[in-house]
């Protein structure tokens, strides 16, 4: 079983955290925009 076949669990964790961070930033931005437009 070659290491290259898999993305290891830490790499997957880091990607998940990056996605979470990105979504939080995008959603936060949208929320601020909505409040501003009211």
């Amino acid at each position: 079983h070659s290491d290259g076949i898999f993305t290891d669990s830490y790499s997957r964790y880091r990607k998940q955290m990056a996605v979470k961070k990105y979504l939080a930033a995008v959603l936060g931005k949208r929320y601020k925009q909505r409040v501003k437009n009211k």
Partner: antibody
Framework: SVEESGGRLVTPGTPLTLTCTAS????????MIWVRQAPGEGLEYIGF??????NTYYASWAKGRFTISKTSTTVDLKITSPTTEDTATYFC?????????????WGQGTLVTVSS | DIVMTQTPASVSGAVGGTVTIKCQAS??????LSWYQQKPGQPPKLLIY???TLASGVPSRFSGSGFGTEFTLTISGVQCDDAATYYC??????????????FGGGTEVVVK
């Protein structure tokens, strides 16, 4: 390198905070774990902190008994209410950079003795 | 939490001989397992990670194999300096297993 400090003799129920200090490395890039070893016993995993985002996770038995936190240069382990069973040498270790490649960098450990 | 079971608890090996230590995980951890050597009064030393990759500076007489739930550490051509306690550790972290990285109970290697 990493170095643990703060171990001493405490009476049961007295909170104690241990500190893991990193020299020459940026802690924010690594996963850090705390492990303990009672005299003559094996290694017991306590928990870890992702020093980048501050997320913490604990072994089931350790939840509520320990708190892991970080500053820019240290990772701390608080023993919330020590009992005599918490007498052990406490180690911190650094992932490389995460956990999947094992933990290559260990401190020498700090001894905690809980006794009345 | 994942449980790591190591066998035997103690093993004796002759200088130049071969010693084999087994580690079993309670669920699949793919190839994310490491092995450590610990001598009295010292912290653990990483020997092998990803089940079979030798850590930096570790002699080639140490080798690891396995995948899923069954793993083996082999010391070929045992030397006196190899007398120590050896531990396996789960390094497979997921939300489902709460990112917990337990150790096996340890195997003491006595060199004759």
């Amino acid at each position: 390198s990493v170095e643990e400090s703060g171990g001493r003799l405490v009476t049961p129920g007295t909170p104690l905070t241990l500190t893991c200090t990193a020299s020459g490395i940026d802690l924010s890039s690594y996963a850090m774990i705390w492990v303990r070893q009672a005299p003559g016993e094996g290694l017991e995993y306590i928990g870890f902190i992702d020093a980048g985002d501050g997320n913490t996770y604990y072994a089931s038995w350790a939840k509520g008994r320990f708190t892991i936190s970080k500053t820019s240069t240290t990772v701390d382990l608080k023993i919330t209410s020590p009992t005599t069973e918490d007498t052990a040498t406490y180690f911190c270790a650094r992932g490389d950079p995460g956990w999947s490649n094992g933990f290559a960098l260990w401190g020498q450990g700090t001894l905690v003795t809980v006794s009345s | 939490d994942i449980v790591m079971t190591q066998t035997p608890a103690s093993v004796s090996g002759a200088v130049g001989g071969t010693v084999t230590i087994k580690c079993q995980a309670s669920q699949s951890i793919r190839n994310e397992l490491s092995w450590y050597q610990q001598k009295p009064g010292q912290p653990p030393k990483l020997l092998i990670y990803k089940a079979s990759t030798l850590a930096s500076g570790v002699p080639s007489r140490f080798s690891g194999s396995g995948f899923g739930t069954e793993f083996t550490l082999t010391i070929s051509g045992v030397q006196c300096d190899d007398a120590a306690t050896y531990y396996c550790q789960n390094n497979y972290g997921t939300r489902r297993n709460n990112y917990v990285f337990p150790f096996g109970g340890g195997t003491e290697v006595v060199v004759k």
